[in-house]
Interface confidence: low
């Protein structure tokens, strides 16, 4: 379920692109990163392909978007709020937060200078 | 300053098995993001991409040529390899390897070796 | 596979005028654009990314724009060195695909 952004402007295009993208391998990067490879993660076999396959697979999904810092982060707050809720406890949340601010060096291209992550209501 | 450099025969008989090793000069092989390449031009024509290596393993091929080439990397020794099988004439070229950059809004080939001249012939 | 068209297929122009080259992708390649020079006996040599950018060390009279469909390279004064062929590439998906060359001589 996608969020609801009450952003103005030419923000539209940027989640037109989020949409458009397939943020499912950044996910699953970060959860493999937070909770080990060897570790069973409810929503997928993440078992099945190793963390570093999955990070170039989140960067060449995040390769398709626009080369703003608005979009990539955009992009990250998306996939908080696609992963709040399966995140158990505060520590997860935040290991979560951390992973997810270092995904654009990871991917070798611009970090976001200023991206809000608390894009939950308070649920993350 | 990265440096690339391939090595193999310079002369192939026909029917027979292209193998070439394109040597890396530091740690890179192994880095996120970049795609490691082989790049042929016949003599007085134009740039084919071949197929490209990411360090895991994941390949990706130029469909008219997938059913002969082989590509594969020993990161430990910062080599990537190419075999292409079954040539002809056709397949004589100067040979490049190359390093692709995947970077986000960055997708290039920014650094060749100096190429290396394959000459199928009987 | 998408297909990259380069016109004109040869450019005489004298050194000190501006050269124009056209790469014409189909289907769009968004920005997804490369450029590169290559001498006689040389490997080629990156030159712009993302359809504009300039990479490392190239002269600012290289220039190029584009999106999409349509892309120009333009040199703005041809330097005696500037005379080679030239490529566009692209990568918006795999695989990746060279144009045919452009190349520029002396008049």
């Known amino acids: 379920m996608r969020r609801e952004r009450g952003r103005q402007g030419d923000s539209s295009s940027c989640e037109r692109q989020v949409d458009r993208v397939n943020l499912k391998p950044c996910e699953q990067h970060i959860m493999q990163r937070i909770m080990g490879e060897q570790e069973q993660y409810d929503s997928y076999d993440i078992r099945s392909t190793r963390s570093s396959d999955q990070q170039q697979r989140c960067c060449d999904e995040l390769n398709e978007m626009e080369n703003t810092q608005r979009c990539m982060c955009e992009a990250l707050q998306q996939i908080m709020e696609n992963q709040c809720d399966r995140l158990q406890d505060r520590q997860m949340v935040q290991q979560f937060k951390r992973e997810l601010m270092n995904l654009p060096q990871q991917c070798n291209f611009r970090a976001p200078q200023r991206c809000d992550l608390d894009v939950s209501g308070g649920r993350c | 300053q990265l440096q690339l450099q391939e090595s193999g025969p310079g002369l192939v008989k026909p029917s027979e098995t292209l193998s070439l090793t394109c040597s890396v000069s530091?740690?890179?092989?192994?880095?996120?993001?970049?795609?490691w390449t082989w790049i042929r031009q016949p003599p007085g024509k134009g740039l084919e991409w071949i197929a490209s290596?990411?360090?895991?393993?994941?390949?990706y091929y130029n469909p008219s040529l997938k059913s002969r080439v082989t590509l594969s990397v020993d990161t430990p020794k910062r080599q990537f390899f190419l075999r292409l099988s079954s040539v002809t004439a056709a397949d004589t070229a100067v040979y490049y390897c190359?390093?692709?950059?995947?970077?986000?809004?960055?997708?290039?080939?920014?650094?060749w070796g100096q190429g290396a001249m394959v000459t199928v012939s009987s | 596979e998408i297909v990259l068209t380069q016109s004109p297929a040869t450019l005489s122009l004298s050194p000190g005028e501006r050269a124009t080259l056209s790469c014409r992708a189909s289907?769009?390649?968004?920005?997804?654009l490369a450029w590169y020079q290559q001498k006689p006996g040389q490997a080629p040599r990156l030159l712009i990314y993302?359809?504009?950018q300039r990479a490392t060390d190239i002269p600012a009279r290289f220039s190029a724009s584009g999106s999409g469909t349509d892309f120009t390279l333009t040199i703005d004064s041809l330097e005696p060195e500037d005379f080679a062929i030239y490529y566009c590439?692209?990568?918006?998906?795999?695989?990746?695909?060279f144009g045919g060359g452009t190349r520029v001589e002396i008049k």
């Open positions: 190359a390093r692709y950059l995947d970077y986000v809004w960055l997708r290039a080939f920014d650094v």
């Open positions: 530091d740690d890179s092989i192994s880095t996120p993001s970049y795609f």
């Open positions: 290596i990411y360090y895991t393993g994941t390949t």
């Open positions: 289907p769009s390649v968004g920005r997804f």
């Open positions: 993302d359809a504009s």
């Open positions: 590439q692209h990568r918006s998906n795999w695989p990746v695909t």
